[in-house]
């Protein structure tokens, strides 16, 4: 969380941002809040990106003002116009690109004063893994697959019964480049699995951490997966 203070004459307003991550090809949110003003027409929101000379986005007098928007963001940005009055200056970024990563500044002007705060925005690809029993294999084998990751993640297997065990010798992980030549499909195979045990396939890069669990018993198979974005710090 980053909290910024700005000075305009003797007046400053508090602006708060939260570091976040965007999934390539999907829509992302750059979070920013500020002390609200009672009049929408008095609020100006400017989003800037380090190293970019044009504006990322500008909102003033109750509407978007995009005459000074940089080409790389054309047609890809929007604020939540109905939420500006309550202090939400967050930016929706459509079709996140790898090059959208960087430091952004959320700059706010209201009748109370001005303020700004920076945020770090990471971009990459991350997806939920799915763990299945590989019935085609000669021995009891688990297969963990996740369709889109970037940068290349690490894959670690763990088990509930053999906590702390190192499965690197009995697992094999491969990365297959997807058709857009950036993201990769992750496939990891774990051999010699035992029944009545819960196994976890953990995929992690510097943006996200995802886990796929599978519990195999004689009577049923239970699966669960979750994904967590890393380094979401407020500013």
């Amino acid at each position: 969380l980053i909290i910024g203070f700005g000075i305009s004459g003797r007046h400053s307003i508090t602006v708060t941002t939260v570091a976040s991550a965007g999934n390539i090809g999907e829509d992302g949110i750059l979070s920013c809040t500020f002390e609200p003003d009672i009049k929408l027409s008095d609020i100006v929101i400017q989003w800037l990106k380090e190293g970019v000379l044009g504006l990322v986005h500008e909102f003033k007098e109750g509407k978007d003002e995009l005459s000074e928007q940089d080409e790389m963001f054309r047609g890809r940005t929007a604020v939540f116009a109905d939420q500006v009055i309550v202090g939400n200056a967050s930016l929706r970024l459509k079709n996140v690109q790898l090059t959208d990563a960087g430091t952004y500044k959320c700059y706010i002007i209201t009748s109370k004063g001005k303020g700004n705060a920076n945020l770090e925005y990471k971009t990459g690809a991350f997806s939920m893994p799915e763990v299945n029993v590989d019935y085609n294999a000669s021995s009891e084998t688990l297969r963990c697959e996740a369709p889109r990751w970037f940068p290349q993640p690490t894959v670690v297997w763990a088990s509930q019964v053999d906590q702390g065990a190192n499965f690197s010798e009995v697992s094999n992980t491969s990365f297959e480049l997807n058709s857009e030549n950036v993201t990769m499909k992750v496939v990891s195979v774990l051999y010699n699995v035992t029944i009545n045990n819960t196994y976890s396939c953990m995929i992690e890069n510097d943006i996200a951490k995802a886990t796929g669990d599978i519990k195999v018993t004689e009577s049923e198979i239970k699966r669960r997966s979750h994904l967590q974005l890393l380094n979401s710090k407020a500013s």
């Epitope: 800037l48 380090e50 190293g51 970019v52 000379l53 000074e68 940089d70 790389m72 001005k114």
Partner: antibody
Framework: EVQLLESGGGLVQPGGSLRLSCAAS????????MHWVRQAPGKGLEWVSA????????YYADSVKGRFTISRDISKNTLYLQMNSLRAEDTAVYYC??????????????WGQGTTVTVSS | DIQMTQSPSSLSASVGDRVTITCRAS??????LAWYQQKPGKAPKLLIY???NLATGVPSRFSGSGSGTDFTLTISSLQPEDFATYYC?????????FGGGTKVEIK
């Protein structure tokens, strides 16, 4: 010491070409946007062109658009201005300048000494 | 493009005088405004950025004020080395326009 040093100016005929260079030292070149600004004899300052830190975005004044090209070589810490189809009104001292501020919202805090371009037949 | 209009275009003043130069933008530039000093045969020097912030190494007798469309550069007590031409410049629009300049001469 932070420094910018221009070179490449000279006398050129109308319609001719010239390439200006600006060697940067004393700062991390690829984190700063850079500008070219010119000043005709006895006149005020006129912004010519700008380039982002990465070199990915370029901007030009209407008076030079389509004729001038700004570029940078990060490995050589050098900024360039390729000037084609030169006209008499391009005669000026050309300065390179560094943009202050990470987001391009501030002024130009470091300037070179300038290089003179004269377009005349 | 945003037009920047400076006034006066020239002024005569004495050492110790308080000098005020104004700059008006044709549309709002918020506080994205800088002031420069230029002496004959020399490159411009940044004095003020973000409308009110003093650049590194600039004496405190220089100050900037304003936001939106109207800006002022003030020299509280003119010194002999301050006789020069002063320019305003906006950074809001990616056309980075300069004002026409104000020449400060010795009375």
């Amino acid at each position: 010491e932070v420094q910018l040093l221009e070179s490449g100016g000279g006398l050129v005929q109308p319609g001719g070409s010239l390439r200006l260079s600006c060697a940067a030292s004393g700062f991390t070149f690829n984190t700063h946007a850079m500008h070219w600004v010119r000043q005709a004899p006895g006149k005020g300052l006129e912004w010519v062109s700008a380039i982002s830190g990465s070199g990915g975005s370029t901007y030009y004044a209407d008076s030079v658009k389509g004729r001038f090209t700004i570029s940078r070589d990060i490995s050589k810490n050098t900024l360039y201005l390729q000037m084609n189809s030169l006209r008499a009104e391009d005669t000026a001292v050309y300065y390179c300048a560094r943009l202050l501020g990470r987001f391009g919202e501030y002024g130009m805090d470091v300037w070179g000494q300038g290089t003179t371009v004269t377009v005349s037949s | 493009d945003i037009q920047m209009t400076q006034s006066p275009s020239s002024l005569s003043a004495s050492v110790g005088d308080r000098v005020t130069i104004t700059c008006r933008a044709s549309q709002t530039v918020y506080t994205w405004l800088a002031w420069y000093q230029q002496k004959p045969g020399k490159a411009p020097k940044l004095l003020i950025y973000d409308a009110t912030n003093l650049a590194t190494g600039v004496p405190s007798r220089f100050s900037g004020s304003g936001s939106g469309t109207d800006f002022t550069l003030t020299i509280s007590s003119l010194q002999p080395e301050d006789f020069a031409t002063y320019y305003c410049q906006q950074s809001y629009s990616t056309s980075w326009t300069f004002g026409g300049g104000t020449k400060v001469e010795i009375k």
